[in-house]
């Protein structure tokens, strides 16, 4: 049994880091493998992650971490029984994938304005809370070409757009994702999408 693709990990910079790797053949990850991880810190204890299958030869493990900060560095040991298959390290702050924003809501009761709001996925005491920026994707269910991205570079988790920038009388969907420049993160996953019917009063032709 050998590791074909070494583990690569990303952290949500809060409580979970996800590591993925591939074996050289079909593997029952949860029964055959264990990923041991330990913070390089005074008094830290080793923890064991039981991986799940991610395709025939792929494995994924969700590492639980407390109080993630920039200084943290973890040792990783991948075991198959008594055999050490791979040894490495992981610094969560250098591989951050933020949590996806939630609770995306489209408020259509403001006159001729669409207000989209969503929730910051981090608590106020997490460093990323004040450092997320967002991308909002709006698309038409009827017209695949009607697809647009709005970059939200301010901290407030909301976006205002004129309803007239979208076509009237058809349904749209929106979703939002986040990233943080300070840690050069990847983009988060998209939030679940939300749907609304866009309608507004056309201005009278002269």
């Amino acid at each position: 049994m050998k590791v074909l693709q070494e583990p690569t990990c990303v952290s949500d910079y809060m409580s979970i880091s996800t590591c993925e790797w591939k074996m050289n053949g079909p593997t029952n990850c949860s029964t055959e493998l264990r990923l041991l991880y330990q913070l390089v810190f005074l008094l830290s204890e080793a923890h064991t992650c039981i991986p799940e299958n991610n395709g025939g030869a792929g494995c994924v493990c969700h590492l639980l971490m407390d109080d993630v900060v920039s200084a943290d560095n973890y040792t990783l040991d991948l075991w198959a029984g008594q055999q050490l298959l791979w040894k490495g390290s992981f610094k969560p702050s250098e591989h951050v994938k933020p949590r996806a924003p939630g609770n995306l809501t489209v408020h259509t009761n403001v006159s001729d304005t669409l207000l989209l709001t969503w929730s910051n996925p981090y608590p106020p005491d997490n460093y990323l809370y004040n450092h997320l920026t967002y991308a909002v994707n709006i698309w038409s269910e009827n017209d695949p070409a009607d697809f647009r991205i709005y970059n939200v570079t301010y901290l407030e988790p909301s976006l205002r757009i004129a309803a007239s920038t979208l076509k009237s009388g058809i349904s749209y969907r929106a979703r939002v994702r986040a990233w943080a420049q300070c840690y050069n993160t990847t983009w988060s996953e998209w939030s679940p999408s939300t749907k609304w019917h866009n309608s507004y009063r056309e201005p009278f032709e002269q």
């Epitope: 810190f41 005074l42 008094l43 830290s44 204890e45 407390d66 109080d67 900060v69 920039s70 200084a71 943290d72």
Partner: antibody, heavy 116, light 111 residues
């Protein structure tokens, strides 16, 4: 919100021991390390040691090895610092502080006076 | 006695900028992260800066930290009378006796 509530002031005779408590609330007690530091009157901060509330393991500053004992009670989310063989130089305010590489939250401090 | 050296005192007028230095070595600041603590008279220390230059929520952006080599600096702009306090730097000893260190402390007086 996070609170670290320390026990009240103590007056001790030289050679005696003192046990200071620090009750934590507002967070997952076993998820954060707890440090102890002290500050003699008019002096700076001095680190004493650290305890991992999860397993109870400890590490102490060399200066206090053999004289200090840090323990925890997970049922009450309380950590304790006991200092033995007290001398007058141990007169100080003793602080518990939550954190790992840096200390996020501090207790208000417990004044321990050692006097004959 | 601390191996992190700070000036015993600094002073400046309200509205001015002041900097406090913290000098260490390769086995501490040079190889670790720096934090700063503010201790107002008669109170417990409070975390002001961590991870060299990050502020906890609630700390105004008048306070900033930086690190270069084996030294670190705390800068306070727009000085206010309420900033009068003792300031301590902190880091880790990364040699064999791995443990936290505090600086000698600096008394800031707002004139």
């Amino acid at each position: 919100q996070v609170q670290l509530v320390q026990s009240g002031a103590e007056v001790k005779k030289p050679g005696a021991s003192v046990k200071v408590s620090c009750k934590a609330s507002g967070y997952a007690f076993t998820s954060y390390y707890m440090h102890w530091a002290r500050q003699a009157p008019g002096q700076g901060l001095e680190w004493m040691g650290i305890i991992n509330p999860s397993g109870g393991s400890t590490s102490y500053a060399q200066k206090f090895q053999g004289r200090v004992t840090m323990t925890r009670d997970t049922s009450t989310s309380t950590v304790y610092m006991e200092l033995s063989s007290l001398r007058s130089e141990d007169t100080a305010v003793y602080y518990c502080a939550r954190g790992k590489w840096w200390l996020y939250n501090w207790g208000k401090g417990t004044l321990v006076t050692v006097s004959s | 006695q601390s191996v992190l050296t700070q000036p015993p005192s600094v002073s400046a007028a309200p509205g001015q900028k002041v900097t406090i230095s913290c000098s260490g070595g390769s086995s501490n600041i040079g190889n670790s992260y720096v934090s700063w603590y503010q201790q107002l008279p008669g109170t417990a220390p409070k975390l002001l800066i961590y991870d060299n230059n990050k502020r906890p929520s609630g700390i105004p952006d008048r306070f900033s930290g930086s690190k270069s080599g084996t030294s670190a600096t705390l800068a306070i702009t727009g000085l206010q009378t309420g900033d009068e306090a003792d300031y301590y730097c902190g880091t880790w000893d990364t040699s064999t006796h791995r443990h936290p260190l505090f600086g000698t402390g600096t008394k800031l007086t707002v004139l």
